[in-house]
Amino acid sequence: EAHKSEIAHRYNDLGEQHFKGLVLIAFSQYLQKCSYDEHAKLVQEVTDFAKTCVADESAANCDKSLHTLFGDKLCAIPNLRENYGELADCCTKQEPERNECFLQHKDDNPSLPPFERPEAEAMCTSFKENPTTFMGHYLHEVARRHPYFYAPELLYYAEQYNEILTQCCAEADKESCLTPKLDGVKEKALVSSVRQRMKCSSMQKFGERAFKAWAVARLSQTFPNADFAEITKLATDLTKVNKECCHGDLLECADDRAELAKYMCENQATISSKLQTCCDKPLLKKAHCLSEVEHDTMPADLPAIAADFVEDQEVCKNYAEAKDVFLGTFLYEYSRRHPDYSVSLLLRLAKKYEATLEKCCAEANPPACYGTVLAEFQPLVEEPKNLVKTNCDLYEKLGEYGFQNAILVRYTQKAPQVSTPTLVEAARNLGRVGTKCCTLPEDQRLPCVEDYLSAILNRVCLLHEKTPVSEHVTKCCSGSLVERRPCFSALTVDETYVPKEFKAETFTFHSDICTLPEKEKQIKKQTALAELVKHKPKATAEQLKTVMDDFAQFLDTCCKAADKDTCFSTEGPNLVTRCKDALA
């Protein structure tokens, strides 16, 4: 129903705390360079204004759209052009073009320092002094670094953060209580960020239809007992929620997500038997829980998929009658039978089925043509299964760090023109798939591996779009989202690449490396590894292993030496010479 004042409506629905959090996230995602204090001031002004509209919906400006209200606030910021350059030009436009313009200026890789966690005592002190401000800082810092983070989910992570601090700051050993717990939240939040970015990419590049197909597959896997009409309703609602969040309409998004959670909990009988524990939780936890609820038990009596989609004489007639509905039912029926497949694979199969019908239904004898379609799925299914087996075997053999290095070598050979920091970030993220997925039961590995890899490769594509340097990467990123991962996997050494000349300074290290945290040490070593591959793209695994072992030994020796600086300055050049010889 239409409301006289949209802002009053959302304030009433969401409540002050969530309203303020979402407005802060929205501003932080649009203007990523502003300080927390600048944004907090705007949030307070917007909240005060919302309250006046709640008191009197007919008050001045209360009838304006949220985009107009928020856009006017952002455009009133002093020194906008000095700080944000051409983003200031957005302010010359009218809605809805102004909001579109803001969206186009979101930066997936803002030049902000890494979000450093203060040490435990300091963190607990500022948390106890002002929990609201502390959590505000968290929302601001995460949102500005991840401009497409799923806003209601970020509120959930802030709530988690809050609970951990409340618990751990009361402990004697705050550090050992906080570190593992906050590391866990950080890891989950980073995965949530790349997954949501993938959804927004799907929406932006291929539209709502593509996202809805993704949602149908995912929901059908999770809720195999729900009928097609129910799955379609859930997919439509979920598409609306994600469209709103990806479009910067965070208040509407969070409100509609809460509505969807409410609907699911009121209709458990027709959706799934596994929802009750989620539905017993408060709002943010409930919605989060529903988003990752375990798959319901598959019905025992499902007929073979071939009956309706291959053997039925009506296939082409049904396809002609309503193409999207027929393909939707195929995707639903196939997905509910295959919780062990990735969504990407299911969408590739649906695409193959569609292409087969397009071709075969135009022939004089369609059944003879499409009769073998299910057999033609086999290579499409085998390819990711082999990928999972090969990579999980390698992960089990090498461990996470060694697995990351193997991926780094592979991807540097595929796209040596890509900047070393991007390659290292990508390889480290891709390498985490081992820890995340390879330890799962067999039937959960494939969906975990492939859908995670697809999300990470989406980030590679986004970063590459900013500064395209590799034809290989451009080729894989230009195709459909579901074909990206197979495309990257199929890439081989880029034969067009002219190797980098050997620069001694690239491989020169100093004693400061010894005091770095383990993660930073790894990144330094991985940076050197990528540079080695750029120098010798066709170096063998043995050659690279020799060099990296030598390098690790050198670091170990010099970091244990009494005079570290002397060790680095004398042994460093020897290491460089040995590296050159080993790779000659």
């Epitope: 004489q313 082409c316 007639k317 396809y319 002609a320 009658e321 239904c361 135009a362 022939e363 369609p366």
Partner: nanobody, 115 residues
Framework: KVQLLESGGGLVQPGGSLRLSCAAS????????MSWVRQAPGKGLEWVSS????????LYADSVKGRFTISRDNSKNTLYLQMNSLRPEDTAVYYC????????SSQGTLVTVSS
């Protein structure tokens, strides 16, 4: 909504000719192969002939081969069946169908071959 409307049937003497038409709407006609099927009184559905979307490929049941010709005009979204040398056993209700379907989703047109 898919609609198929057959016309052109009637009473004809053995050895005579008829041309059946099927006007199609509600789908991308040129993208789909089309067929003619028939149902004689008291019998089941029998496939008669099929044609590809482009019109380049045609198939016929042995019982009509050399006597019937299937064709289409994609600009008019219309399917045809030219029936020559008609026999009493060709008496049936004729239906046009999409892509090899052996079901009646339209009214059909009655062809009676009798002296």
């Amino acid at each position: 909504k898919v609609q198929l409307l057959e016309s052109g049937g009637g009473l004809v003497q053995p050895g005579g000719s008829l041309r059946l038409s099927c006007a199609a709407s509600g789908f991308t006609f040129h993208s789909f192969g089309m067929s003619w099927v028939r149902q004689a009184p008291g019998k089941g559905l029998e496939w008669v002939s099929s044609i590809s979307g482009s019109g380049s490929d045609t198939l016929y049941a042995d019982s009509v081969k050399g006597r019937f010709t299937i064709s289409r005009d994609n600009s008019k979204n219309t399917l045809y069946l030219q029936m020559n040398s008609l026999r009493p056993e060709d008496t049936a209700v004729y239906y046009c169908t999409i892509g090899g379907s052996l079901s009646r989703s339209s009214q059909g047109t009655l062809v009676t071959v009798s002296s």
